[in-house]
Amino acid sequence: APVRSLNCTLRDSQQKSLVMSGPYELKALHLQGQDMEQQVVFSMSFVQGEESNDKIPVALGLKEKNLYLSCVLKDDKPTLQLESVDPKNYPKKKMEKRFVFNKIEINNKLEFESAQFPNWYISTSQAENMPVFLGGTKGGQDITDFTMQFVSS
C-alpha cells in the first residue's frame, strides 16, 4: 500500500517555531513576519503501527530532504536525531520503529511519543534557540505540547 504524506509545520505551546540548526539538528525559537519562512516544513507520513482514535503513528521527514527524525540510544539514553535515508526507499508504510512517533491529541495540543521508547516525547526547552530533543518527562519544565499547521504541497 502507498504511504500518504502531508506537509506541515509545528509550533510548541509557547508558539516557538522549529528551524534547522546545522545539518542534523533542529532548534526552537520565536519567529515573526518574514522570518517564519525559516521554519522547517515536515512531510508527515501516516505509517503502520498501533493506532487508536487519539493516537496515530506517523513519521516526520523534512520536506524534500532525505532526513527523518529518529530515536536511538546514545550513551544508554533515548536521543532524538535527524537521520539520513535513501530517498529511493523512503517514506514507506512499514517504517523502522526508530522513525515512528505516536501523534497523540489531548485537548487542543499534540504530543509526539517515540514508538521505540514509550513515554519519551519530542520536546523543546523553555529557553530560546535551544535544540529540539527527546525528553522523558511530561508536565515539567520542558515543553512536550505542540500545534500543527498543515500546509499545501
Epitope: D54, E105, N108, M148, F150, S152, S153
Partner: antibody, heavy 119, light 107 residues
C-alpha cells in the same frame, strides 16, 4: 442521527468580518475532525478550513490563509469559522462537514449558511 | 496542487440508462478518491470513498472504480432520484481539491 446546523451567514461589506457557527449533534463531536467547505453560487466545491478533533491541527488553503481562522468548542459541540477581510469572491454557501480521522473524506454535511460579500 | 478533471460536465439520460462519469487527476493519487452527490438546493452527500467503497445507505446501482489517475462513477440503472450534480475529490496531498462537477439531467 448525525446533525450539523450552520448559522451566522448574512450580508457583509468588503473588508468586513463574520463568524459562522456549526452546532453538531447525534455523535461524539470531540472524536471527529471537522471542516468548512464552500460553494459559490452556481459553482463547484472548495475546501476552506480544517481542524482536528482536539483542535491541535489546522489547515487553510492559500485562498483564505491569514484571513480565516477555525476553532471548536468540544464542550458545546460547536465548530466556528472566523472570516476577516472578506472579499466579493468569498460569497458562497458555507457548509460544515464531519471528516474521517486521517484528513480524508467528508461523511456528513450540514445544510449550509449563505455568506454574501457586497457593498 | 493536483488538478481534477471531470467529464462530461453535463449529460442527459433517461430513467434506466447506464451512466458513467469520469474523473482524471494530474498526478497519481492511488485510491484516495471520493465521490459526492448534490441535489439542487441541498448539501453534498457521500457516495463512494477509497475509489470503490460504497458509503452506508448508498444503493448498489452506484459503483466506483479506478486507481492512479483515472476513476469512474457508474450508475447501472438511473433512477429519478439520481438526477443531481456529482463531484469527485482527492485526498492524497494538500490541498484536497474537487472536480468541477457533472450535472446529470433528465433527457
Amino acid at each position: 442521527e448525525v446533525q450539523l446546523v450552520e448559522s451566522g451567514g448574512g450580508l457583509v461589506q468588503p473588508g468586513g468580518s463574520l463568524r459562522l457557527s456549526c452546532a453538531a449533534s447525534g455523535f461524539d463531536f470531540s472524536r471527529y475532525d471537522m471542516s468548512w467547505v464552500r460553494q459559490a453560487p452556481g459553482k463547484g466545491l472548495e475546501w476552506v478550513a480544517y481542524i482536528s478533533s482536539g483542535g491541535g491541527s489546522t489547515y487553510f488553503p492559500d485562498t483564505v490563509k491569514g484571513r480565516f481562522t477555525i476553532s471548536r468548542d468540544n464542550a458545546k459541540n460547536t465548530l466556528y469559522l472566523q472570516m476577516n477581510s472578506l472579499r466579493a469572491e468569498d460569497t458562497a454557501m458555507y457548509y460544515c462537514a464531519r471528516q474521517n480521522k486521517k484528513l480524508t473524506w467528508f461523511d456528513y454535511w450540514g445544510q449550509g449558511t449563505l455568506v454574501t460579500v457586497s457593498s | 496542487d493536483i488538478q481534477m478533471t471531470q467529464s462530461p460536465s453535463s449529460l442527459s439520460a433517461s430513467v434506466g440508462d447506464r451512466v458513467t462519469i469520469t474523473c482524471r487527476t494530474s498526478g497519481n493519487i492511488h485510491n484516495y478518491l471520493t465521490w459526492y452527490q448534490q441535489k439542487p438546493g441541498k448539501a453534498p452527500q457521500l457516495l463512494v470513498y477509497n475509489a470503490k467503497t460504497l458509503a452506508d445507505g448508498v444503493p448498489s446501482r452506484f459503483s466506483g472504480s479506478g486507481s492512479g489517475t483515472q476513476f469512474t462513477l457508474t450508475i447501472s440503472s438511473l433512477q429519478p432520484e439520481d438526477f443531481a450534480n456529482y463531484y469527485c475529490q482527492h485526498f492524497w496531498s494538500l490541498p484536497f481539491t474537487f472536480g468541477q462537477g457533472t450535472k446529470v439531467e433528465i433527457k
